[in-house]
């Protein structure tokens, strides 16, 4: 049978040939009659055999990390017969390890984030080195980790590579640390190889700082002309934290006047002082308010850092603005009777300069030929007024500061012209009536109505009468309907076109005014030649042909 021990060849041997071991048949008596042959992987190139003795040599430098075993086949032949002495057999040559590989950190670069103020013992990251040497061969691949840089804030567990915090850190003092870790093989014994890696450890922010005003006093100004909502200035607190932990909210702590507000610009983290109510320099020319600032987000466990909010005082000076004159009323309504003489008093308007200077005021009326205004604001008439021409006047009164003619205010003034009874009633239209020669007594000739240009205080009431002369000798009579109309009726039977072709009746119309006014109005009545049916007529004026139907009402 075959005789051999297990074969090992150390890696990285520099000699031209290294004796690995010996293969032999137990039938070999040493008389050189047997020939040994090596077949298979690496035979002839990596390993050779002494054909006479069976000694195997490695003729190449081997790298265990490249290839750690070779499976070869051995043959032994009797030279005299050419026959195999033993059956072909496989054997293994193992490449034994030497410590020729340093530990390597394959997952570089390492970066970790840990919250600032984390307690001692907090796990940061685990670093792992690999050693290509044989882990089953002594301590060649047994590693120990140590910290080369990073004390006193960090520590590393020697066997695991776990980095932990060993001292609390404040991000506001230093926000990142470079830690250097060394891995040594041979568990750190002499002859060990080492590798290092750098770990960037960043501290994440916790909200351990409250916002603080750098300024204890801010001075701001606001124009008295500023509308509500105007931004009058900004205030700013500073927070050493970052991101969400530095977001802050400003608010008013004291403002007795409730004139101001503060809103927060969340992009710039500034407080914007806003005018909540309009200010008046003449009423109050300075204000004092107190503002405070707090973080927007505060975790319960970090409340100890946020017990008292930072405050600041804001002095606000109101700037005087030359304001236009101010009328006592937004508009005026005056009344004046019509027909009052030129120069009559209408009313007084009054404007004042709201500024401390108290400039005298000049008044004017825009585009009016009927009224005048003096420097005291007194409005008078320049003409007699007729209500029946214009019952209302809409005036625009302008007040101008004497010392600054650009400061102008205007208001409307409404003048109502009051009625007096200065118009008598009169026919509402021109009336021309007709009567047939054969008309009977009591026949309605015309219904008349009147109008009065005066304004009725309650309601117009007109009274209709014939003149005294017509009453005494009239062929016609009048009946007042008591509704501001009257009817004219025939007072006899039969008329003669040739003798009296036309009648002129004087009608008196009186109103119910105080004093009452009366007018005399003439009604013309034509006598016509009517046919039997009474539907056509021929009057004295042949050009006038009318078709009429007479009927007594």
């Amino acid at each position: 049978g075959w005789v051999w021990n297990q074969f090992f060849v150390p890696e990285e041997m520099n000699t031209t040939s290294h004796h690995v071991g010996r293969l032999r048949s137990d039938l070999d008596n040493g008389n050189n009659s047997f020939q040994y042959k090596l077949l298979g992987a690496g035979a002839g190139s990596t390993f050779i055999i002494d054909e006479r003795t069976g000694d195997i040599y490695a003729i190449e430098k081997l790298d265990r990390e490249e290839r750690s075993l070779y499976i070869l086949r051995a043959q032994v032949i009797d030279i005299t017969t050419g026959r195999a002495v033993e059956p072909e057999s496989e054997f293994v040559i193992k490449v034994s390890d030497i410590n020729d590989n340093e530990p390597k950190f394959l997952d570089e670069p390492y970066e970790a984030i840990v919250p600032e103020m984390s307690p001692e013992g907090t796990l940061v990251i685990q670093v792992t080195a690999s050693d290509a040497d044989d882990p089953s061969s002594g301590n060649n691949a047994r590693l120990l980790y140590s910290l080369l840089q990073g004390q006193p804030y960090f520590s590393v567990e020697p066997t695991t590579g776990v980095i932990r915090i060993s001292s609390k850190m404040d991000r506001e003092l230093q926000d990142e640390y470079w830690v250097i870790i060394q891995a040594k093989d041979m568990i750190g014994q002499p002859g060990a190889l080492s590798g290092t890696t750098s770990v960037l450890i960043k501290l994440s922010d916790v909200n351990d700082n409250k916002p603080i005003f750098k300024e204890s006093l801010y001075r701001l100004t606001v124009s008295e002309s500023a509308p509500t909502g105007t931004s009058i200035g900004t205030i700013m607190a500073y927070d050493n934290d970052i991101g969400e932990n530095a977001e802050m909210d400003y608010s008013i702590e004291e403002d007795d006047s409730q004139t101001f507000d503060i809103i927060t610009n969340h992009e710039t983290q500034e407080g914007i002082v806003i005018l909540k109510k309009k200010v008046n320099f003449e009423h109050q020319n300075h204000y004092g308010i107190r503002a405070k600032v707090k973080n927007h987000h505060v975790d319960e466990q970090l409340m100890k850092y946020h017990t008292e909010a930072s405050t600041t005082f804001i002095k606000i000076q109101v700037e005087d603005v030359d304001e236009p004159p101010l009328f006592l009323l937004p508009y005026y309504i005056f009344e004046i009777f019509e027909e009052t003489p030129q120069g009559s008093f209408v009313g007084v308007v009054s404007a004042t300069d709201p500024d401390n200077r108290k400039s005298p005021i000049r008044y004017s009326i825009t585009r009016s030929k009927v009224f005048n205004i003096d420097d005291n604001g007194t409005i008078t008439t320049t003409n007699s007024l007729d209500r029946e021409i214009s019952a209302w006047y809409n005036l625009s009164i302008t007040a101008t500061e004497k010392y600054n003619i650009e400061q102008i205010s205007s208001i409307p003034v409404y003048v109502q012209v009051l009625n007096i009874n200065d118009h008598a009633p009169e026919f509402s239209q021109y009336y021309e009536s007709y009567v047939c020669e054969n008309a009977g007594s009591g026949q309605v000739i015309q219904t008349i109505s009147a109008v009065d240009r005066d304004e009725s205080i309650e309601e117009h009431h007109f009274y209709f009468n014939l003149s005294v002369e017509d009453t005494n000798s009239s062929s016609f009579t009048i009946i007042d309907n008591q509704d501001n109309t009257a009817v004219i009726l025939t007072n006899r039977t039969g008329f003669n076109l040739q003798e009296e072709p036309i009648f002129y009746i004087s009608i008196l119309i009186a109103d119910n005014g105080i004093p009452s006014l009366t007018s005399t109005n003439t009604l013309t009545i034509h006598v016509c030649d009517c046919d039997d049916s009474g539907s056509t007529q021929t009057c004295q004026y042949q050009e006038l042909m009318l078709s009429m139907g007479f009927k007594t009402e």
């Epitope: 077949l39 992987a41 035979a43 190139s45 490249e66 290839r67 499976i71 290509a132």
Partner: antibody, heavy 120, light 108 residues
């Protein structure tokens, strides 16, 4: 897991040099115990081993191609490359890269392959 | 170099049948250094068996390998539709590494 991907021109002129690169992902080319190999397959034919390389640079080539073949490695890019010079139409084939387990010599895994045609 | 001869060149079988593929080496090969691969059209080869008889990860147990010296066999106990492909043997025993010419298993 480890994956391999071949890349390079699909057409090469006769007498020129064929150049291919294999990019390794999901693992390091610097891992011990593996060779990084090139194999080719002529259209409709069997497989032919071209050669392989260890990450430290040691190469092993098929004697039939040795005079024309160069395999190199770039550990920083996790890539290895094949150069085959003086190509002829007979070099038209699908070229595969694969990982070889150095102790026992099996190929696993393989790239999906890239067809290289040698033509003028 | 070691020449690996695969037979038959083509094997026509039906799903469910047993397939026996042969790989003969021109000289003795260590069984540790023999592997089998499966290749489907348009795809790269896939490792089935290494060390002559060990199944690769994820390979169904209907695939088995055996043999030593110069004669090696791949057996598919019961053919599934996805098993129809070309099969190659490969040796690592002696440089250069060589592959067999392949056996095509096709549907009958």
């Amino acid at each position: 897991q480890v994956q391999l991907q071949e890349s390079g021109p699909g057409l090469v002129r006769p007498s020129q040099t064929l150049s291919l690169t294999c990019t390794v992902s999901g693992g390091s080319i610097s891992s011990g115990g593996y060779y990084w190999s090139w194999i080719r397959q002529h259209p409709g034919k069997g497989l032919e081993w071209i050669g392989y390389i260890y990450y430290r640079g040691r190469t092993y080539y098929n004697p039939s191609l040795k005079s024309r073949v160069t395999i190199s490695v770039d550990t920083s890019k996790n890539q290895f490359s094949l150069k085959l010079s003086s190509v002829t139409a007979a070099d038209t084939a699908v070229y595969y890269c694969a990982r070889v387990y150095s102790n026992y010599g099996w190929f696993d895994p393989w790239g999906q392959g890239t067809l290289v045609t040698v033509s003028s | 170099e070691i020449v690996l001869t695969q037979s038959p060149g083509t094997l026509s079988l039906s799903p469910g049948e047993r397939a026996t593929l042969s790989c003969r080496a021109s000289q003795s090969v260590s069984s540790s250094y023999l592997a089998w691969y499966q290749q489907k059209p348009g795809q790269a080869p896939r490792l089935l068996i290494y060390g002559a008889s060990s199944r690769a990860t994820g390979i169904p147990d209907r695939f088995s390998g055996s043999g030593s010296g110069t004669d090696f066999t791949l057996t598919i106990s019961r053919l599934e539709p996805e098993d129809f492909a070309v099969y190659y043997c490969q040796q690592y025993d002696t440089s250069p590494l060589t592959f067999g010419g392949g056996t095509k298993v096709e549907i009958k």
